[in-house]
């Protein structure tokens, strides 16, 4: 399923466009709970991966493509 990461923001920021002011703090998480597709406003949230929505927390989570890590799959995995 790839690497799963989650951002803790719950303020509804859209985090996909350049002008968006997203929360800076992020946390890694294992796949727990239930997921649905991320709302459309998060279309570009995951840089190199697929966005999933943590239903219980109403937060976006990224499943990174192979070779990428980070809360938004924004970093190349040097150990890959």
């Amino acid at each position: 399923d790839g690497n799963s990461t989650r951002s803790p923001e719950t303020n509804g920021l859209l985090c996909g466009d350049p002008e968006e002011n997203c929360a800076a703090t992020t946390t890694q998480s294992k796949r727990k709970g239930h997921f649905s597709r991320c709302p459309k406003q998060y279309k570009h949230y995951c840089i190199k991966g697929r966005c999933r929505f943590v239903v219980a927390e109403q937060t976006p989570s990224c499943v990174c493509d192979e070779g990428y890590i980070g809360a938004r799959c924004e970093r190349v995995d040097l150990f890959y």
């Epitope: 239930h34 997921f35 649905s36 597709r37 991320c38 709302p39 459309k40 697929r50």
Partner: antibody, heavy 119, light 106 residues
């Protein structure tokens, strides 16, 4: 090829029960969310229930407390247990595969099974 | 939940362009998908994520979504395109379908 095959439909009296089955083949069943969608005679499509690949369930308001969706990944089968059936539940019931998780779209459909609730 | 409204019927002459609308409050903020259903058959996905086309679906099918209206467009409509068409979106952890539009190719 990817295929969904429903069974279990039939004639049942109001207040009765029925269990629908949907046999999946041609893909890794356990990796997908699945849903049931129904269509009353001459009417449009109505989503009934969905079941995520990790067990999360969701229902349309009109069937909550009466219908239960479940799956057996070892048998590649999706189920819909329907209790306290009403005349308005009469419809063709389709099993559909959600692309990846909930919230995407239905990329594979079964041929449907007819449920008739009548005395 | 969001309510999706479609015209009950649309008529088009062969070779012409057919447009089927799906209206809903701020629907442009949601992904909209379109299904084709012919009599006695199961629905078939023809457009997903507003404007993407599954493999095997002819190029004459296209979609758009903005503001309060999503649109399915069939360019150079053929007789075989006569069917019911349904829009669909995901809202508040549930699936919502439009009421359907019967496309008649005159």
């Amino acid at each position: 090829q990817v295929q969904l095959l429903e069974s279990g439909g039939g004639l049942v009296q109001p207040g009765g029960s029925l269990r629908l089955s949907c046999a999946a083949s041609g893909f890794t069943f356990s990796s997908y969310a699945m849903s049931w969608v129904r269509q009353a005679p001459g009417k449009g499509l109505e989503w009934v229930s969905g079941l995520g690949h990790v067990g999360y369930t969701t229902y349309t308001d009109s069937v909550k407390g009466r219908f239960t969706i479940s799956r057996d990944n070892s048998k590649n089968t999706l189920y819909l247990q329907m209790n306290s059936l009403r005349a308005e539940d009469t419809a063709v019931y389709y099993c559909a595969r959600d692309y990846l998780d909930f919230g995407y779209y239905f990329d594979v459909w079964g041929q449907g099974t007819l449920v008739t609730v009548s005395s | 939940d969001i309510e999706l409204t479609q015209p009950p019927s649309v008529s088009v002459s062969p070779g012409q362009t057919a447009s089927i609308t799906c209206s809903g409050d701020k629907i442009g903020k949601k992904y909209v998908h379109w299904y084709q259903q012919k009599p006695g058959q199961a629905p078939v996905l023809v457009i997903y994520d507003d404007s993407d086309r599954p493999s095997g679906i002819p190029e004459r099918f296209s979609g758009s979504n903005s503001g309060n209206t999503a649109t399915l467009t069939i360019s150079g409509t053929q007789a075989e395109d006569e069917a019911d068409y349904y829009c669909q979106a995901w809202d508040m952890q549930s699936v919502v379908f439009g009421g359907g539009t019967k496309l008649t190719v005159l």
